[in-house]
Interface confidence: low
Amino acid sequence: IPVIEPSVPELVVKPGATVTLRCVGNGSVEWDGPPSPHWTLYSDGSSSILSTNNATFQNTGTYRCTEPGDPLGGSAAIHLYVKDPARPWNVLAQEVVVFEDQDALLPCLLTDPVLEAGVSLVRVRGRPLMRHTNYSFSPWHGFTIHRAKFIQSQDYQCSALMGGRKVMSISIRLKVQKVIPGPPALTLVPAELVRIRGEAAQIVCSASSVDVNFDVFLQHNNTKLAIPQQSDFHNNRYQKVLTLNLDQVDFQHAGNYSCVASNVQGKHSTSMFFRVVESAYLNLSSEQNLIQEVTVGEGLNLKVMVEAYPGLQGFNWTYLGPFSDHQPEPKLANATTKDTYRHTFTLSLPRLKPSEAGRYSFLARNPGGWRALTFELTLRYPPEVSVIWTFINGSGTLLCAASGYPQPNVTWLQCSGHTDRCDEAQVLQVWDDPYPEVLSQEPFHKVTVQSLLTVETLEHNQTYECRAHNSVGSGSWAFIPISAGAHTHPPDEFLFTP
């Protein structure tokens, strides 16, 4: 570590005095301090001498000697006071620029350490400091305003009490700069706008930043609009607002509007689209197929997208039949707004019952009129099967009726022994009926088909089974001829609990 001679932390001299400060180190050494008049600097081998033959108050300051070659970066310092009765302060800067929340050092150096007890910091023209200004003083360095705020950007003076009167320093301008995190924040409202020709419209573009130095403009289809700007300051942010007011819109006002703001950190922009229409409109659509098929007992959500301007004056879901006169429960109808002009309406149909098949219509109304969108809901059922023995045109015939949706396919099986259901090992014969007769096929109802199997002679130790299947499931009915007459066996009792 270099050594300074005289070996004292502080040196107090009078104006006009000769001051010689010598720094000695192992290698070359350097002096560092506030640039000020009258100093002479020269080297002598491994020492460096800083001297003046005519010290003034401006030489007051801390002088540091460093050894550049020292990897530990050791240094020694001495503080020089040139105590001038007429000049209690040596101000090293006229302006101090810091960022907000940094400590701001106002470098008023006392020329006489004895004066330390009577120092204070004031704003120019003797005005007191702003409330909550937290500061400290060091005779070597000056006043430090801790965690400076933008509002503390002021002109300050340092005051010392000399012989019962306050003596002021020249002023120091403190500039506390906002820490600008990025380009200004932007809002453009509305995000989308639709108006009928002749209506009024308003588009507001606003930008805000912690710093006042930013620009904002609104452009329409790449043409910058000349709109007077309103400025404001609140919540510690500067706001600039451009309001475009159109009292009678026309088609040339339609298009893309962009709100653009920029500062030193960059540019932000946000856009919206303005549609001008000739008249009110109301469009209903669905991403779903309007013809729906759902297995009985399952649930379904019917969704309708609505695009409308002006807004809806009314809407509802209606059940159009054909079964009961029930209407959808309001609690099952849900509306969500995607944005100002688009909405989604959902009707939830949980655990569908047979009586709930049919047509569901969503109706909406606005000044443009009524619109409706109708869904057709058909329920799918697994087949139900029954078999009877009868004579048709004198021939013994097994008659199988199968009811379900979609239309069931019918297969006959003949197997050995008496069984509720033929398994593969027992099967003697299989007949597919590709075209069973459709007995009933009404919209939203089950389809009932009938298949006939003509049997000349019933084999008594055999079972005849009618199997029906569709995309939902299958059903069967076993027919067992016995000497006392035919006997039929459904495989299980058909349970239906939707």
Partner: antibody
Framework: QVQLQESGPGLVKPSETLSLTCTVS????????WSWIRQSPGKGLEWIGY???????NYNPSLKSRVTISVDTSKNQFSLKLSSVTAADTAVYFC???????????WGQGTLVTVSS | QSVLTQPPSASGTPGQRVTISCSGS????????VNWYQQFPGTAPKLLIY???QRPSGVPDRFSGSKSGTSASLAISGLQSEDEADYYC???????????FGGGTKLTVL
């Protein structure tokens, strides 16, 4: 059709305050920006300032220290006050409604104000 | 001294095409749209062209505007005696944060 009509004294003494009113008819003042423009032989057309119905104003920097524009929505009027006038303020003063591109679509017929003692 | 520069006068004979120029800077014409006004003696200016080249309804298509860089021009084709008037260009000025005008051009139909 929007119509604008300026009114106020045609003669103002130097150092006094010039006061003019613009009455808007055929439309509400509660939209658009409203402006004062003057035309003098020496300076041509010169924009003085804008006002919005909310009271927000924007002035020409060269006149900012002397000008005040205010609005009275209940009367569908806006006003101009120009203080400390000199002979250089002698001009025809127009009120106008601003276009969104910065132009002026509707103008009053103008009123001549002479600054003279 | 006007911010935008126009020739003080222009002239032409009936049927001719006349062009009036308007010169500005990057803070006005260079970055904003130009408007043109027609003014007859003793009346208020009338908007003739807005947004560089747009005509308000009622303005004949003989009047057209254009802009290039920091200059703009107004063209009048098929000059008519009733076109004799003062013509002013105007543009928004970013540094002023308001509109600026040209000094005006007096058009004479010979």
């Amino acid at each position: 059709q929007v119509q604008l009509q300026e009114s106020g004294p045609g003669l103002v003494k130097p150092s006094e305050t010039l006061s003019l009113t613009c009455t808007v008819s055929g439309g509400s003042i509660s939209s658009y920006y409203w402006s004062w423009i003057r035309q003098s032989p020496g300076k041509g057309l010169e924009w003085i300032g804008y006002i919005y119905y909310s009271g927000s104003t924007n002035y020409n920097p060269s006149l900012k220290s002397r000008v005040t524009i205010s609005v009275d929505t209940s009367k569908n009027q806006f006003s101009l006050k120009l203080s400390s006038v000199t002979a250089a303020d002698t001009a025809v003063y127009f009120c106008a409604r601003a276009l969104l591109t910065g132009g002026f679509a509707y103008w009053g017929q103008g009123t001549l104000v002479t600054v003279s003692s | 001294q006007s911010v935008l520069t126009q020739p003080p006068s222009a002239s032409g004979t009936p049927g001719q095409r006349v062009t009036i120029s308007c010169s500005g800077s990057s803070s006005n014409i260079g970055s904003n749209t130009v408007n043109w006004y027609q003014q007859f003696p003793g009346t208020a200016p009338k908007l003739l062209i807005y947004s560089n080249n747009q005509r308000p309804s009622g303005v004949p298509d003989r009047f057209s505007g254009s802009k290039s860089g920091t200059s703009a021009s107004l063209a009048i084709s098929g000059l008519q005696s009733e076109d004799e008037a003062d013509y002013y260009c105007a543009a928004w000025d970013d540094s002023l944060n308001g509109p600026v005008f040209g000094g005006g051009t007096k058009l004479t139909v010979l």
